[in-house]
Each structure stands twice: as structure tokens, then as C-alpha cells.
């Protein structure tokens, strides 16, 4: 499928609108600090060039790779050295090293101002007067803050963003219509970004085999009626799509994702009975829908797994002859029978089974050695079951905010070297698992809980990688993808940690606290809580609870006072003194 001009090929496949949007996303994810107007200029130049190649594929430079074309364009930015420092050195390299260099400079936590939402009327006016610029600004702002956002999915979000404004800017009460929709889009966007970040981390840190294994588990759970060949085909294509997107090849990624959606819809009968509705939708919605489709019903006639994987006399022969295929089939067969297990658990079971075969197939009596292999799975299964039970009980007892606090204390004691903002952000996200998963029926709880926790812990891993401060975090993040969550769960209080010196400034609050939203107030309180634990790592939960209750009462009291600032100034030191006593 060789094309004389790759850029012309993608322009024709994707159409001008999607082409421009994807190039904008790609550039925004690479050059996260560049102003919007600069990016628009670059995108327009690339688009005009692409059009000349569509007209004549043999025209000058049209035969160049997309990386070469895009990299050359990025390297024309005048302020590259001043804005990005050593990222400018990438421009001295040749492809493919240059693109690898750009990828390594992607920043998961760029130093950008928080997005402030303008008044509804201001947004509606901007939308109605300059719709195209308004939507492109959305793509730009999201992409630069989330440099691994799944690009074709971001186009879907932009479509939903546009629909929200189209509907609500005509409504009687624009705010009541629009704001909940924007909140929902923001939350869904953050979730989508975090999920994709795990996929990219999986590919980049643990390789294609790890990603394929995870995909086999998920696809098999979703399409239990599909045969192994079909699952393998979908997994191979899916791996290509995500490898491309994670590698910055957004045009190829979007094109291949559309191809995969087409394939799935043309082969519904051999994949799943749940695809019909998705396949009736237009492209972006169709792909989104297929990615989130519910699990199909399990076939009724599935035979016992032990037949092929324990009882068969050919287990070692089959394993030896084609290790990856045999293990892929095991994972497929186990996963399609267990929609109630998390993908990570299924991968742990496959790893345990593989280790047992490595051990037993070497011996003179392999069958005698691996006969009880399925019994060895029990503790692996019970671990996430207990995790779900324990944490959902805590969530139901405390509610989300106090459950987040419980997790914040737990994780601050485990890894006190990690920065407080990171601990707060990660613990808040970990705590959301309760709201998201604990209301689910029993059969859906474990996959919801554990796979969500994997996504959140990956956020901790990527943030920590930027500035590593804890060997324990590094160890849990790098040793094994599937065992990250059990690794973090198993961490005890770090006894080697020297308590942080008391800093009065950390515990000094002002009247501006009263004007903060509920969420912002929670973050302030949780920041204080983490700092408190770092100062007194031996404090018990009861002691911390007392201090936090006193703190909440202090904020409430001062926010009701006539002279709020005076109240904070006067009562603050008293609170600090009382806390010191309570924690002594």
C-alpha cells in the first residue's frame, strides 16, 4: 500500500477538516508552550502544502515522510530555544531520532495557567461569531495540556463541545443548559486522557507484547463469542492504532482507527451482537461507541478450561512450539469466561500460568507438576476481591471526600517524599473510584475498580518520572505493569522517612479561602492534611481526624466572621498550637 506522497494519501483519506484538526493537535502536543496563533499559522502552511501534493504527488518534497515534513515545520519556530531550551537540540537530529527526541520532551505537567471558564454569554458570543476558531482553540488548549490525548477521540470531544454550544447558546437559560455539559465533558476528557496515558506508558515502557496482552484480555471480555483469530486481528490492528497515536503519528492513527471501525462493523456477526447501534453512527461517534461497547453475552457451550490447559497431554508441546500463540489463546479463553475479572488480574493469572509451565515443562513429570496450577490462582483472585470489598466498605462509610482523605493519609505515609500536590491529585483521583465503581453490580465491580486504579497509579508514575524522589515509587512503577497496583497496596509506612520540619506558612490561611469553590476548599484542606502527615508521620487516623475536624470548624467560623482576615490571623495560630498538642 505504498503511496508516492504520504501527506497527500492522508489528506485524501481524512478530508481537509480532520486533517487540519489532527495536525493542530499534533503540533500542540509537541510544542505545548507555543501561542495558538503560531500553531494556526503552521497548520495552514502544512495544509496548503498538502493540497499541492494532492494535485501532484510528484511535486517537490511531497515524497517526504510525515515526520520529516512536520519536524521541519516545527523547527522553523523562531523562539524554540528560548521557549523550550534543550528541546531545540532535537532539530539538529535526523529522522527518526528527531521525532523520538520531540516525544521525550512531551511534558505531562506543563507549566500552563489553569483554564479559566469565561462567562456563558462571552463564550456563546465567541462561538457564534468565530465558530471555527473557537473549536480549534478547544483542541489546542486540551492537546497542549494533555500531550498524549488520543487524537481521534479528541476530535469526537470537540464535536460534543460544538453540539453543547449549538444547543445551549439558543436556550432560554444558557448557563443551566451549558455548564453541566461542559463539566461532564471536562471530567470525561480527563478520564479519557488518563486512560490513554496508561496505554502509551504500557507501549513505551513495557513494549508491544505487554500492550497486546492487555488488549487480548479486554477484547476477549468484550467479544466472548468471537474466535481467537478474530480477536487476534482486532488486537493487532488496535495495537497499530495506539502505537501510532502514542508515537505522534496522529494522521496514520486516525486513518487506521477508521479502518478498524469499518472492519468491525463489516464483521459484526463474527465479533459481537452489541455492535449494531454503534455501527449506524457517523465516523467519530462510531469509533467512540465501539471503544466503549458493553460486553457481549458469553457463549453457553464453553468447555472447562482445564481440558486444554491442565488435562491435555500436549500442554508442554503446544507451549514450546508457539509460546506467544499458546499464551495468547490461554489469555483469550480465560478472559472470555471472566468478564467479572479485571484485565490486570487476567494478565497476572496468565503470567502465573506461564511461570508454572516454564517450571514444570522442564521436569520429568510435567503433568504432576502443573496439575494444581489453577488452585494456585486462588490467592491472586482473592487479592483484588478483598481490595474491592475493603475499599467500597470504606467509601460507603465515609463518602467520597473523607475516603479521599483516608487514601491521602495512607499514600502519604507510604511515599512521603512525593510532592504534596501530586499526592493530593492522585489521592483525590483514587478516591473517585468509590463514586465510579462501588455502585456497580458485583460482576462489574472488580474490573471497574482495579482497572481504574491502574489508570490513576499510572498518573502517579508519569508525574514521578519527571522528578523522581522515591525509590519505592520507581520500583512499583517500573518492575511490572500488571503488578503496579498490588505493589503500591503492599507498601507499608516508610519507616526511613525523617519528618518534615514544621513550616508555619504551610498552615497559614487567609480570607480568600472563603471565596473558593467547594472543590478548591477541599484541595486546600487536603494539602494541609498531607503536610501534617509529612510533619507527623506517626500520627494515628484518630488524631488526624480530630485535627481535620478542628480545621473545618476553623474555616467555617472565620468565613462567617465580619472581619474574615482578622479571624484567620487570630484563630490560625491557635489551631496550629492545638494541632501540635493533639498530635504530640
Amino acid at each position: 500500500d505504498a503511496h508516492k506522497s504520504e501527506v497527500a494519501h492522508r489528506f485524501k483519506d481524512l478530508g481537509e477538516e480532520h486533517f487540519k484538526d489532527l495536525v493542530l493537535v499534533a503540533f500542540s502536543q509537541y510544542l505545548q508552550q507555543c501561542p495558538f496563533e503560531e500553531h494556526l499559522k503552521l497548520v495552514n502552511e502544512v495544509t496548503e502544502f498538502a493540497k499541492t501534493c494532492v494535485a501532484d504527488e510528484t511535486a517537490e518534497n511531497c515524497d517526504k515522510s510525515l515526520h520529516t515534513l512536520f519536524g521541519d515545520k516545527l523547527c522553523t519556530v523562531a523562539t524554540l530555544r528560548e521557549t523550550y531550551g534543550d528541546m531545540a537540540d532535537c532539530c539538529a537530529k535526523q529522522e527518526p531520532e528527531r521525532n523520538e527526541c520531540f516525544l521525550q520532551h512531551k511534558d505531562d505537567k506543563p507549566d500552563l495557567p489553569p483554564l479559566v471558564r469565561p462567562e456563558v454569554d462571552v463564550m456563546c458570543t465567541a462561538f457564534q461569531e468565530h465558530e471555527d476558531t473557537f473549536l480549534k482553540k478547544y483542541l489546542y488548549e486540551v492537546a497542549r495540556r494533555h500531550p498524549y490525548f488520543y487524537a481521534p477521540e479528541l476530535l469526537f470531544f470537540a464535536q460534543k463541545y460544538k453540539a453543547a454550544f449549538t444547543e445551549c447558546c439558543q436556550a432560554a437559560d444558557k448557563g443551566a443548559c451549558l455548564l453541566p455539559k461542559l463539566d461532564e465533558l471536562r471530567d470525561q476528557g480527563k478520564a479519557s486522557s488518563a486512560k490513554q496515558r496508561l496505554k502509551c506508558a504500557s507501549l513505551q515502557k513495557f513494549g508491544e507484547r505487554a500492550f497486546k496482552a492487555w488488549s487480548v484480555a479486554r477484547v476477549s471480555q468484550r467479544f466472548p463469542k468471537a474466535d481467537f483469530t478474530e480477536v487476534t486481528k482486532v488486537v493487532t490492528d488496535l495495537t497499530k492504532v495506539h502505537t501510532e497515536c502514542c508515537h505522534g503519528d496522529l494522521l496514520e492513527c486516525a486513518d487506521d482507527r477508521a479502518e478498524l471501525a469499518k472492519y468491525m462493523c463489516e464483521n459484526q456477526d463474527s465479533l459481537s451482537s452489541k455492535l449494531k447501534e454503534c455501527c449506524e453512527k457517523p465516523l467519530l461517534e462510531k469509533s467512540h461507541c465501539l471503544a466503549h461497547v458493553e460486553n457481549d453475552e458469553m457463549p453457553a457451550d464453553l468447555h472447562a478450561l482445564t481440558d486444554d490447559y491442565v488435562e491435555s497431554k500436549d500442554v508442554c508441546k503446544n507451549y514450546a512450539e508457539a509460546k506467544d500463540v499458546f499464551m495468547g489463546m490461554f489469555l483469550y479463553e480465560y478472559s472470555r469466561r471472566h468478564p467479572d475479572y479485571s484485565a490486570m488480574l487476567l494478565l497476572r493469572l496468565a503470567k502465573a500460568y506461564e511461570a508454572t509451565l516454564e517450571k514444570c515443562c522442564a521436569t520429568a513429570d510435567p503433568h504432576g507438576c502443573y496439575a494444581k496450577v489453577f488452585d494456585e490462582f486462588q490467592p491472586l483472585v482473592e487479592d483484588p476481591q478483598n481490595l474491592v470489598k475493603h475499599n467500597c466498605e470504606l467509601f460507603e462509610q465515609f463518602g467520597e471526600y473523607k475516603f479521599q482523605n483516608e487514601l491521602l493519609v495512607r499514600y502519604t505515609k507510604k511515599v512521603p517524599q512525593v510532592s504534596t500536590p501530586t499526592l493530593v491529585e492522585v489521592s483525590r483521583n483514587l478516591g473517585k473510584v468509590g463514586t465510579k465503581c462501588c455502585k456497580q453490580p458485583e460482576a462489574k465491580r472488580m474490573p471497574c475498580v482495579e482497572d481504574y486504579l491502574s489508570v490513576v497509579l499510572n498518573q502517579l508514575c508519569v508525574l514521578h518520572e519527571k522528578t523522581p524522589v522515591s525509590d519505592r515509587v520507581t520500583k512499583c512503577c517500573t518492575e511490572s505493569l500488571v503488578n503496579r497496583r498490588p505493589c503500591f497496596s503492599a507498601l507499608e509506612v516508610d519507616e526511613t522517612y525523617l519528618p518534615k520540619a514544621f513550616n508555619a506558612e504551610t498552615f497559614t490561611f487567609h480570607a480568600d479561602m472563603c471565596t473558593l469553590s467547594e472543590k478548591e476548599q477541599q484541595v486546600k484542606k487536603q494539602t494541609a492534611l498531607a503536610e501534617l502527615v509529612k510533619h507527623k508521620p506517626k500520627a494515628t487516623n484518630e488524631q488526624l481526624k480530630t485535627v481535620m475536624e478542628d480545621f473545618a470548624a476553623f474555616v467555617e467560623k472565620c468565613c462567617k466572621a465580619d472581619d474574615k482576615e482578622a479571624c484567620f490571623a487570630e484563630e490560625g495560630p491557635k489551631l496550629v498550637a492545638a494541632s501540635e498538642t493533639a498530635l504530640a
Epitope: A355, T363, A364
Partner: antibody, heavy 121, light 109 residues
Framework: EVQLVESGGGLVQPGGSLRLSCAAS?????????ICWVRQAPGKGLEWVGC????????YYASWAKGRFTISRDNSKNTVYLQMNSLRAEDTATYFC?????????????WGQGTLVTVSS | DVVMTQSPSSLSASVGDRVTITCQAS??????SAWYQQKPGQPPKLLIY???KLASGVPSRFSGSGSGTDFTLTISSLQPEDFATYYC???????????FGGGTKLTVL
């Protein structure tokens, strides 16, 4: 580069003890491998001592080695050990550690250079 | 315990000769045998595994055959670098297995 390096050999008196180490690099024990010890007395043939499975620590020994020799592993250090007790003159040999061909044990494709143990008074 | 009896214990031959070494297991071991080459001062090098499969990087003049109890290593056309000692091994990891043959020293005639 994938390799095994033995250490800990030397001169020891009869009845004494010695612990040999086999450090792996280029691959991780956490992926589960068999690591075996083989010895060779000066001018003699190869003699299988035993093996450990890095996954769960399962061990097998040649019948003559049982009781006196113990094989263990420390996955965090990517190292396998051979603890030898009640040493005799006939234990004098070069001790090699080796890894079988992965995917079903077919023979040992990765060997260390060996470490010499001399048992003498 | 399985015993691997290798013969001959020594053998002299010339460059270009076809050489055969045999190994007999004291009990049936399926195709679980391997052959190694060892030169002085070096660790052994795997030549053949699973009775007949050529290990990675080994020249095709080496071949293995046999199953059950009788196994053979053949060098079709001896090269100068092939003069060394050869060992067979039962490749089960088990307390009663893992034994090597006594070795065959191949020298220049």
C-alpha cells in the same frame, strides 16, 4: 548484553563451607527462569549439580548433592547462590552456572565462565 | 538415576571426515537430550537440543538424531575448529535426571 557471572570460588579446607554467587545481567529473574549449576573437576567431565526456578524458588538436585549443597535465589539482586557445606577434596572443580534455553528446557544455551573451588588442607 | 553412557570416550579423525558419537540413556527420556562442545578453558557450548534441533549460530554440519534411549551426534565434514570434547546430556530438570555423558575427546589423527 545477556550474561551470567560466577564468583565466590577459592581455597577452602576440607569440612569447610563456601557460597558461590551467579549474577545475571541483561535479563530479569522476575520473568521466571531455571538457573542451574554444573561442575567440572580438573581434567574430568561435566557433572550436573542442580537447578533453581527463579519464579518460586523450586529446586532440584543431583542425588549426590542432596543434603550438602543448597541452591537459592534473590530476585531483587538477580542472583542465584550455591551454598556448599562439608566440602571434600573431590568437590574441587570449576563451578559453572547456566541458563537453559527458554520456552521448555532443552539444554543450556547461556553459561558463565566458571569459578574455581579448591578443597585442600 | 538416569545414566548417560557416551561412546567412544576418545576419537581421532581428519579434517573432512564424517564423525559420529553416540549416547545411550539408561531409561527412556523421549527426545530430551542435548549435545555440547567444550574447548579447554571455556564453558560448554550448546550444539543440539531436543535430540535433533540445531542451536542458534551452530553450523549445519552438526546434526543430532534419536529418541527414547539412543541418541547420535554427527559432524558431516570435520573442520579444524571442531576438535574439542563433546558431551551429551539428559535435559530433564529433576532429581533423578540432568546427567551428562562422560564425554568424547575428538583429536586430530
Amino acid at each position: 548484553e545477556v550474561q551470567l557471572v560466577e564468583s565466590g570460588g577459592g581455597l577452602v579446607q576440607p569440612g569447610g563451607s563456601l557460597r558461590l554467587s551467579c549474577a545475571a545481567s541483561g535479563f530479569s529473574f522476575s520473568s521466571s527462569y531455571w538457573i542451574c549449576w554444573v561442575r567440572q573437576a580438573p581434567g574430568k567431565g561435566l557433572e550436573w549439580v542442580g537447578c533453581v526456578f527463579t519464579g518460586d524458588g523450586t529446586t532440584y538436585y543431583a542425588s549426590w548433592a542432596k543434603g550438602r549443597f543448597t541452591i537459592s535465589r534473590d530476585n531483587s539482586k538477580n542472583t542465584v547462590y550455591l551454598q556448599m557445606n562439608s566440602l571434600r577434596a573431590e568437590d574441587t572443580a570449576t563451578y559453572f552456572c547456566a541458563r537453559p534455553v527458554s520456552v521448555y528446557y532443552y539444554g543450556m544455551d547461556l553459561w558463565g565462565q566458571g569459578t574455581l573451588v579448591t578443597v585442600s588442607s | 538415576d538416569v545414566v548417560m553412557t557416551q561412546s567412544p570416550s576418545s576419537l581421532s579423525a581428519s579434517v573432512g571426515d564424517r564423525v559420529t558419537i553416540t549416547c545411550q540413556a539408561s531409561q527412556i527420556i523421549s527426545s530430551r537430550s542435548a549435545w555440547y562442545q567444550q574447548k579447554p578453558g571455556q564453558p560448554p557450548k550448546l550444539l543440539i537440543y531436543q535430540a535433533s534441533k540445531l542451536a542458534s549460530g551452530v553450523p549445519s554440519r552438526f546434526s543430532g538424531s534419536g529418541s527414547g534411549t539412543d541418541f547420535t551426534l554427527t559432524i558431516s565434514s570435520l573442520q579444524p575448529e571442531d576438535f574439542a570434547t563433546y558431551y551429551c546430556q539428559c535435559t530433564y530438570i529433576d532429581s533423578n535426571f540432568g546427567a551428562f555423558g562422560g564425554g568424547t575427546k575428538l583429536t586430530v589423527l
